[in-house]
């Protein structure tokens, strides 16, 4: 059963239908909506059978409508239910007010029913002008908007209407007068120099598009100097002015074609800066140092003239950057008076000249480089130098063969001596000396030195070898040793070593009393303050004892006989014969013979007598072993 159809308005442009029906009975419902006066054709809607309510939008405001509904069940239509209802009146805008007024904008507020309008149409028109209005639309949800881009101090009429798809409300209007353009704040000059000044000003942030600055020399009809600067700036450097000149500076702000009332300030630039306090001091013997004072960042450059006081024609000119306040002038003559002048240049202007006089110092000298106390590993240096000048001396030690690294010493300028140690012995060196002071390095002087050899002990020589000894000699550095120790040991180490201590001046030792024909080792050491050198060594064999042999008797006669013998050649100085009768009845006969002899006829003996004969050789004062024989004189 379909029943209880009710129709209620939904706003001014819609109706709401509600009905009751059995659940799950209907396939669909068909609804017909028609103006009661049937001006327009009816609207038909088919809605699902599950629905029990529906909104019908898009109707006319304040209009009576007839609404019918029937249901369809398996192709059957139910009886039609009908009802009548009217849509509501069109909503009006409430009120419109200007909430905030500036000099170039305002804020508009208004009231309106919620959800009534798709958008609002706002028209902004200058009153009393035929200029085209500004139009804008804002979404229907808004109740406020800013209207920028207005003219200052201007009457405006502002109209607003609410708009839906097919409807526009009656407009609401309001009139408003924009504010005057705001004035600028203070204009001040914060820095003044001789050629520039700095302007500072105050103004509301974000107000001005730009500022125009006009700089004009006071009392001059010359064209003013104009600058346009961005509206964000609050400070500006004005360069390129003349020194000592009065200026009028004006400033106005500009915003969308409007100009503020100008601010003005008067200012006088500083006088052209002067150089001051020129001081000249000596920098050693070949230079002068200039110091002066001057305003910062003022000068393009300085021109300095240096000339000997007594030589007008020979001037030296220097152009220096304007940032400098001091300069060294090198390459001058020692002990010479100089006149120094300086002026500054500022954009073509020359400052007055400052002058001063000063003399260079006496040329410092070094000389007489002397090497002394040379040892195997060191030497001493001494030199002369001008007092009170040098901060340091540089000493370079280079070996003449360039095999060693160069050694460099820096020592105090007060010193006049140096001890150089740690050098290798027996090496030639060149010593270079130069003096250093601020901005001075003297010419280098040099000397040569050769380190001593380490004391030498060498060339152990054995000479004069004989059966009973030999001579030991050696070479040694002069005055190097306090003493020498000569040690003699037999090769078989059967005998005690013999030690001989000799003075440091001796170079030879004659050894005697040794055993013939055996090997000996000789060692020689030197001593310095008790320190022993490694010994020199030599080995030697003494000669075998020279022999006299083969003593023969021949040619016996009643008063004698002939004797002959053999002996080593060149060994004996002489021979000694001793002859005595075996019964010792007569005095013995002793005969000394010269070395070359090997025979001797003996006479003056008794007949038929037996004699004992002994023979020995003498070599360097020593006797050889004796050889003997028996001989008998013949019968008479």
């Amino acid at each position: 059963e379909l029943e209880n159809l009710t129709v209620t308005e939904v706003g001014w442009d819609g109706l709401r239908l509600n009905w009751t029906a059995a659940d799950q009975a209907y396939e669909h419902f068909i609804i017909q909506v028609q103006e009661a006066n049937k001006v327009e054709a009816a609207r038909n809607l088919t809605v699902p059978g599950s629905l029990r309510a529906v909104d019908i939008p898009g109707l006319k405001a304040a209009t009576p409508y007839t609404v019918s509904i029937y249901g369809v069940i398996q192709g059957y239509r139910t009886p039609v239910l009908s009802a009548e209802a009217s849509t509501g009146e069109t909503p009006n805008l409430g009120e419109v007010v200007v909430a905030e007024v500036g000099w170039d904008a305002l804020k508009l507020n208004w009231t309106a029913p919620e959800g009534a309008y798709e958008y609002f149409f706002i028209q902004v028109q200058e009153a009393d002008t035929v200029e085209a209005a500004q139009n804008l639309t804002v979404p229907g949800g808004l109740r406020s908007t800013d209207l920028p881009g207005l003219k200052a101090a201007t009457h405006y009429t502002i109209t607003i209407r609410g708009v839906t798809q097919d409807f526009s409300t009656t407009p609401l209007s309001v009139e408003v007068l924009t504010e005057e353009v705001p004035d600028m704040g203070n204009l001040t000059v914060t820095e003044v120099s001789w050629d520039a000044l700095r302007l500072n000003w105050t103004t509301p942030d974000g107000t001005y598009d730009q500022f125009t600055i006009q700089v004009q020399e006071a009392d001059q009809v010359e064209e003013a100097h104009n600058l346009t600067v961005p509206g964000s700036l609050r400070s500006m450097e004005i360069p390129g002015l003349r020194a000592g000149t009065p200026y009028t500076v004006t400033l106005h702000g500009e915003v969308r074609g409007h100009s503020t009332r100008p601010l003005a300030v008067e200012v006088v630039t500083e006088d052209l800066p002067q150089l001051g306090d020129l001081a000249v001091s000596e920098v050693g013997w070949d230079g002068l140092r200039l110091n002066w004072t001057a305003a910062d960042n003022a000068y393009e450059h300085f021109v300095i003239q240096v000339q000997e006081v007594n030589k007008v024609e020979a001037a030296q000119n220097l152009t220096l950057p304007g940032s400098l306040r001091a300069v060294d002038i090198p390459g001058l003559e020692a002990a010479t008076p100089y006149r120094v002048s300086i002026y500054g240049v500022i954009r073509g202007y020359r400052t007055p000249v400052l002058s001063a006089e000063a003399s260079t110092a006496k040329e410092p000298e070094i000389g007489n480089l002397n090497v002394s106390d040379i040892t195997p590993e060191s030497f001493n240096l001494s030199w002369m130098a001008t007092d009170g000048i040098f901060e340091t001396f540089t000493i370079e030690i280079i070996d003449s063969n360039r095999l060693l690294e160069t050694v460099e010493y820096n020592i105090s300028g007060a010193e006049r001596t140096a001890h150089i140690s740690g050098l290798p012995p027996s090496t030639d060196f060149i010593v270079y000396l130069s003096g250093l002071a601020p901005s001075i390095r003297t010419k280098t002087i040099s000397a040569t030195a050769t380190t001593e050899a380490l004391p030498l002990l060498e060339n152990l020589t054995i000479s004069d070898i004989n059966p009973y000894g030999f001579t030991v000699s050696w070479m040694a550095s002069e005055n190097a040793f306090d003493s020498f120790l000569v040690t003699v040991v037999d090769s078989g180490k059967l005998l005690d070593p013999q030690e001989f201590t000799l003075s440091g001046t001796q170079r030879k030792l004659e050894l005697r009393g040794l055993i013939t024909g055996i090997g000996y080792e000789v060692m020689v050491s030197g001593f310095t303050q008790g320190h022993q050198t490694k010994p020199l060594r030599a080995e030697i064999v003494t000669e075998a004892e020279p022999e006299v042999d083969n003593l023969l008797v021949s040619d016996a006669t009643p008063d004698g006989f002939r004797l002959s013998w053999t002996a080593d050649e060149g060994v004996f100085d002489n021979f000694v014969l001793k002859i005595r009768d075996t019964k010792k009845q007569s005095e013995p006969l002793e005969i000394t013979l010269l070395a070359p002899e090997r025979t001797r006829d003996i006479t003056g003996l008794r007949e038929a007598t037996e004699y004992e004969i002994e023979l020995y050789g003498i070599s360097k004062g020593r006797r050889s072993q004796t050889v003997s024989a028996i001989a008998t004189t013949a019968m008479g």
Epitope: S378, L454, N479, S483, F527, H531, T533
Partner: antibody, heavy 118, light 107 residues
């Protein structure tokens, strides 16, 4: 028993002088060479000077040459070291030592401290 | 110094240690060796080729080769912990020179 006893050390200002003595006993003093060796605090040994048996030959390290003088009095069995123009770097324990002809310093005294400071 | 020594050497108790000394003068002269314990005067332990003064134990010995001299302690004892200085001559003008010293630690 060989004994060497040093004396004369002490505190002295830079540029000042001191005389060290070494009294010897227990050996033939006149037959021995003698010397002085020093040792700066925390440092190694440094030979200073030596003298031969009769006193006719003297030897000096470069660092003290011209400022120190070694001498001996064989009649008193005493060795001396006269130290002039003293410097801070001369601060050390000074040892007296003897050596026979063919050996280095074989006996040493216990040392005397010399301090050079202002 | 004209004689160069290692500043420090260590040895385990009972082990053998060699302390060396280098210098041009050692090509000619034998080195002498001194032992110095803290607060004491030096004591001569080796001189000449390898001679020991009386009272010096035979575990101390010396040797020399070229410009290097060596002191060897065979079977080091705790009482051998000391500073050791080599010493030689550098000729008539520098009659006595000492090495910088080697500190021996017995572990």
């Amino acid at each position: 028993e060989v004994q060497l006893l040093e004396s004369g050390g002490g505190l002295v200002q830079p540029g000042g002088s001191l005389r060290l003595s070494c009294a010897a006993s227990g050996f033939t003093f006149s037959g021995s060479r003698m010397g002085w060796v020093r040792q700066a605090p925390g440092k190694g040994l440094e030979w200073v000077s030596a003298i031969n048996e009769e006193g006719g030959q003297t030897y000096y390290a470069d660092s003290v040459k011209g400022r120190f003088t070694i001498s001996r009095d064989n009649s008193k069995n005493t060795l001396y070291l006269q130290m002039n123009s003293l410097r801070a770097e001369d601060t050390a324990v000074y040892y007296c030592a003897k050596h026979p002809p063919h050996r280095p310093f074989d006996y040493w005294g216990q040392g005397t401290l010399v301090t050079v400071s202002s | 110094s004209e004689l160069t020594q290692d500043p420090a050497v260590s040895v385990a108790l009972g082990q053998t240690v060699r302390i060396t000394c280098q210098g041009d003068s050692l090509r000619l002269y034998y080195a002498s060796w001194y032992q110095q314990k803290p607060g004491q005067a030096p004591v001569l332990v080796i001189y000449g080729k390898s001679s020991r003064p009386s009272g010096i134990p035979d575990r101390f010995s010396g040797s020399s080769s070229g410009n290097t001299a060596s002191l060897t302690i065979t079977g080091a004892q705790a009482e051998d912990e000391a500073d050791y200085y080599c010493n030689s001559s550098h000729g008539p003008r520098r009659p006595v020179v000492f090495g910088g010293g080697t500190k021996l630690t017995v572990l």
